[in-house]
Amino acid sequence: RAPYWTNTEKMEKRLHAVPAANTVKFRCPAGGNPMPTMRWLKNGKEFKQEHRIGGYKVRNQHWSLIMESVVPSDKGNYTCVVENEYGSINHTYHLDVVERSPHRPILQAGLPANASTVVGGDVEFVCKVYSDAQPHIQWIKHVEKNGSKYGPDGLPYLKVLKHSGINSSNAEVLALFNVTEADAGEYICKVSNYIGQANQSAWLTVLPKQQAPGREKEITASPDYLEHHHHHH
């Protein structure tokens, strides 16, 4: 059987903007019979160990390419080629290496994600943050007062639900339990550091109890290089 992808979800994120000195992992999980082989190209040419200081690791059992401590010269297109005697498939990732210099926080695109749940259900919003400088996270909800979303001054009515704290373990997650219709609305993840701020929002839809929620659920996956953001100072 010709090669085929076994987990396309892990391959959806094609553009990886990674801070210098971080580790990058690209994966191309595949199957086939006989079991296909995998090789990697950089910018369309064979990617050799000597092409980068420190080389790279290939974990064939995980169908992955790992580059540690990336530098600007690692920028480019990385293509996995998976082949056996019955065919060949390929997938390309683009790597951009961001120089480490103080910058305002960067929030992972698409997070927090819109979510829906039924009355009485639980839901989680996740906000993935990259910040060299100590980030400060706030979760804020748009609310109504006397039926209006805006005050006499034209400013929105906002409720601050949660602050992060210097070493908070859970500030990137907003968990809502036993939700009611009143919990529906827009939720903002606002992150700031001493340089600037960024915010992204998501909507919570609360459905009547008899109506099951759709597939619109919060995303919790995060790229490898975001995993240890609280240690970047």
Epitope: H136, Q138, I140, K141, D153, L155, P156, L158, K159, V160, L161, K162, H163, S164, G165, I166, S168, N170, A171, L174, A175, L176, F177, N178, V179, D183, K190
Partner: antibody
Amino acid sequence: QVTLKESGPGILQSSQTLSLTCSFSGFSLSTSGMGVSWIRQPSGKGLEWLAHIYWDDDKRYNSSLKSRLTISKDTSRNQVFLKITSVDTADTATYYCARSSDWDDYTMAYWGQGTSVTVSS
Amino acid sequence: DIVLTQSPASLAVSLGQRATISCRASESIDDFGISFMHWYQQKPGQPPKLLIYRASNLESGIPARFSGSGSRADFTLTINPVETDDVATYYCQQSNKDPPTFGAGTNLELK
């Protein structure tokens, strides 16, 4: 109507662990957006925020005291607890618990009457 | 941590006159156009009571002679006219950044 009431040992010795309880009514700490803080005030001095616990059991601490503080809750019994280890005479104060406002997690809209704690050397 | 500097430390005002208390933050505490500054009143032997939230909003049940103003890092609590019942210590507090911090307090007494 929202009420909070603190209770504690009154007097304890240096190096012991201080255990405080905040019993409340008029709201549920399982409601999204709800939170309770502990604040203390040495006699004749200002207010110092100590810790906060959110509806989802997320916790925040005053960084200068973090290693000595533990906040927890029993949602079903409408209680919040604060433990302070290795107390010293500097921990002598009135300890308050306060519920967050409807607008901000760190705005204290409802306060208990406070419980007086004396640490003797 | 954000430091709040209150002034004056104590204030003596005649009955019926205006009392003005200032609070300056070590950095801006504004976000989304909202000033996260709050004012509390504390009488001896009592817990603090929230008077003003978000710089200028009067808490429910608080008399209209109390008002708050300011933005970014400079804030003012005004009591006009001062009544006997207003003798107390007044604290400002910010909730924009973790940890929440209080000013050292202003003691209001009658002249």
